[in-house]
């Protein structure tokens, strides 16, 4: 983790925490994430098919950043959503969302980030995901595109 | 601190926390920060030559905002990085990064912010810094440009 | 809360926390917020006339996101501020602020978000508010525009 091994966790420090980074072989929605290598954290939360699975009800700070870029700007509308799914409920619930329109000069190389972060009351078995409107415009560098949470 | 003196800290509340604000009279990288006056916080973490020095291993939420602005837009590529250095490791590690290209209308007065924030497992003696691609375009108002962290 | 009722809070979990969402009948500054329905949280903090009222001195992470959009871009300068007011002090204190200028192509439909988040030492009876420069350009969807905090 960050260039050095994790310290042995103290008993009290079994924090519910995750920090997942961009995975460039994502081909479909929701986005998939690197959950093993690099500056990744995953403790007391499970990762399954793009989603963070809550296993303890409580308050969580949830965040995500997505880095969009392209070779030639055509101002395709961009959206970045963090949403929640639970088998007890029929519909996805959008927790946080960012949208961009008319954000670059036509024809130019462009780059832009979207950041989301807030507190939510989550229930055991909730699955959290990230969705974007245009996968081909996402850059998946670990420092640029990420998804995480921690239990307060 | 925010217009009123800090309360006497309770014994349990020796929180590892920092909130540093922009310091305008510097031309060096990494960015230097105001660590004394205004809405600054620094407790259980040291500040040294632009860096926050971790003295207790654990999980930290780290954040930074930088406010870029200019009088006449030429779309100079902008980057904003939070990176980590530790004497045991040869290379800086970029923890979070934001980039902007083609973000304003040529010739116009412009302004834009970059925000970064995420959880990391940090080790005692890690030094955290903020870097930008163009110092001349940063505005250092305390409410606009800042760097902070807290131990979970 | 997020599509399912809150669990009965455990004794220890009386967290000071708030997450308020956009309220479209805001007509004046500061912004007003939805404090009851949807993905709202309000515990150990009071909501009063657009403001979050602190009732326990300590360290808080405070955040806000505002979603601006318009039908026809004229690059009206945008600002988004989180500020603090306390009856003991004569003036509002701007804690965090984001500004945008020259951010879209003249005449086009446009959309952009501003995100702020940082740690502050707050005192009992502090009132926190959000201000924007142009209310008519704010979209108040609950996932897009919000204001929150939690005590560390």
């Amino acid at each position: 983790q960050i260039g050095h091994p994790s310290p042995p966790p103290e008993k009290k420090e079994l924090r519910k925490v995750a920090h997942l980074t961009g995975k460039s072989n994502s081909r479909s929605m929701p986005l998939e994430w690197e959950d093993t290598y690099g500056i990744v954290l995953l403790s007391g939360v499970k990762y399954k098919k793009g989603g963070l699975v809550i296993n303890e009800t409580g308050l969580y700070f949830v965040y995500s950043k997505v880095y969009f870029r392209g070779q030639s700007c055509n101002n395709l509308p961009l959206s970045h959503k963090v949403y929640m799914r639970n088998s007890k409920y029929p519909q996805d619930l959008v927790m946080m969302e960012g949208k961009m329109m008319s954000y670059c000069t036509t024809g130019q190389m462009w780059a832009r980030s979207s950041y989301l972060g807030a507190v939510f009351n989550l229930t055991s078995a909730d699955h959290l995901y990230v969705n974007v409107s245009e996968l081909s415009l996402v850059n998946f560098e670990e420092s640029q595109t990420f998804f995480g949470l921690y239990k307060l | 601190q925010i217009g009123h003196p800090s309360p006497p800290p309770e014994k349990k509340e020796l929180r590892k926390v920092a909130h540093l604000t922009g310091k305008s009279n510097s031309r060096s990288m990494p960015l230097e920060w105001e660590d004394t006056y205004g809405i600054v916080l620094l407790s259980g973490v040291k500040y040294k030559k632009g860096g926050l020095v971790i003295n207790e291993t654990g999980l930290y939420f780290v954040y930074s905002k930088v406010y870029f602005r200019g009088q006449s837009c030429n779309n100079l590529p902008l980057s904003h990085k939070v990176y980590m250095r530790n004497s045991k490791y040869p290379q800086d590690l970029v923890m979070m990064e934001g980039k902007m290209m083609s973000y304003c209308t040529t010739g116009q007065m412009w302004a834009r912010s970059s925000y970064l924030g995420a959880v990391f497992n940090l080790t005692s003696a890690d030094h955290l810094y903020v870097n930008v691609s163009e110092l001349s375009l940063v505005n250092f108002e305390e409410s606009q440009t800042f760097f902070g962290l807290y131990k979970l | 809360q997020i599509g399912h009722p809150s669990p009965p809070p455990e004794k220890k979990e009386l967290r000071k926390v708030a997450h308020l969402t956009g309220k479209s009948n805001s007509r004046s500054m500061p912004l007003e917020w939805e404090d009851t329905y949807g993905i709202v949280l309000l515990s150990g903090v009071k909501y009063k006339k657009g403001g979050l009222v602190i009732n326990e001195t300590g360290l808080y992470f405070v955040y806000s996101k505002v979603y601006f959009r318009g039908q026809s871009c004229n690059n009206l300068p945008l600002s988004h501020k989180v500020y603090m007011r306390n009856s003991k002090y004569p003036q509002d204190l701007v804690m965090m602020e984001g500004k945008m200028m020259s951010y879209c192509t003249t005449g086009q439909m446009w959309a952009r978000s501003s995100y702020l988040g940082a740690v502050f030492n707050l005192t009992s009876a502090d009132h926190l508010y959000v201000n924007v420069s142009e209310l008519s350009l704010v979209n108040f969807e609950e996932s897009q525009t919000f204001f929150g905090l939690y005590k560390l």
Partner: antibody, heavy 119, light 111 residues
């Protein structure tokens, strides 16, 4: 509008010193470097050094150490370059230019001051 | 010091045609983020004017017929289509390290 207005032409004798000025306007003087560049007759461009008006820090090209001294007056938004122990080799056009701190490109230039060193 | 070598020293190009100027650095002037090469135009009796920064970015107000490319040690300035007013001397400059240095210049004549 960003402008750099340089002082007029100078004719000085060998061995003397001269102080050239560059008055900046239209931007925040303390947020950008001011660089100085020499151009000898029919020759290319040589970077002399920069000064950061924010804190007065300077950096010189080794070839000009001891020859050039850079200073600023923040109150008037003026940068100065003093050249000492002048010889005919110092005859040139001297430009000041605003330079971005990190990218270090020269995005606005003064009109130039012609220095002639002759007895 | 990083030495920048421009070629050719001079060239003559017909109106409407393409002018290509090369700038070679004695060592790399690129990082993982940017290439620290800038291009200037200078006309007689006037100061230089910034055209291209960071190898490929067009300065505000500069016509789109100017373009820059390259990375590492090899960089190119292209002008297409060349116009009468482009007759000038062109310089590359690096800002990868101190001291900043300029290329020797390329004089463009319009035929």
């Amino acid at each position: 509008e960003v402008q750099l207005q340089q002082s007029g032409p100078e004719l000085v004798k060998p061995g003397a010193s001269v102080k050239l000025s560059c008055k900046a306007s239209g931007y925040t003087f303390t947020r950008f470097d001011i660089s100085w560049v020499r151009q000898r007759p029919e020759q290319g461009l040589e970077w002399i050094g920069w000064i950061f008006p924010g804190d007065g820090s300077t950096q010189y090209n080794e070839n000009f150490k001891g020859k050039a001294t850079l200073t600023t007056d923040k109150s008037s938004g003026t940068a100065y370059m003093q050249l000492n122990r002048l010889t005919s080799e110092d005859s040139a056009v001297y430009f000041c230019a605003r330079s971005l701190i990190s990218t270090a490109m020269f995005d606005h230039w003064g009109q130039g001051t012609t220095l002639t060193v002759s007895s | 010091d990083i030495v920048l070598t421009q070629s050719p020293a001079s060239l003559a190009v017909s109106l409407g045609q393409r002018a290509t100027i090369s700038c070679r650095a004695s060592k790399s002037v690129s990082t993982s983020d940017f290439s620290y090469i800038h291009w200037y135009q200078q006309k007689p009796g006037l100061p230089p004017k910034l055209l291209i920064f960071l190898a490929s970015h067009l300065e505000s107000g500069v016509p789109a017929r100017f373009s820059g490319s390259g990375s590492g040690t090899d960089f190119t300035l292209n002008i297409h289509p060349v116009e009468e007013e482009d007759a000038a001397t062109y310089y590359c400059q690096h800002s990868r390290e101190l001291p900043r240095t300029f290329g020797g210049g390329t004089k463009l004549e319009i035929k």
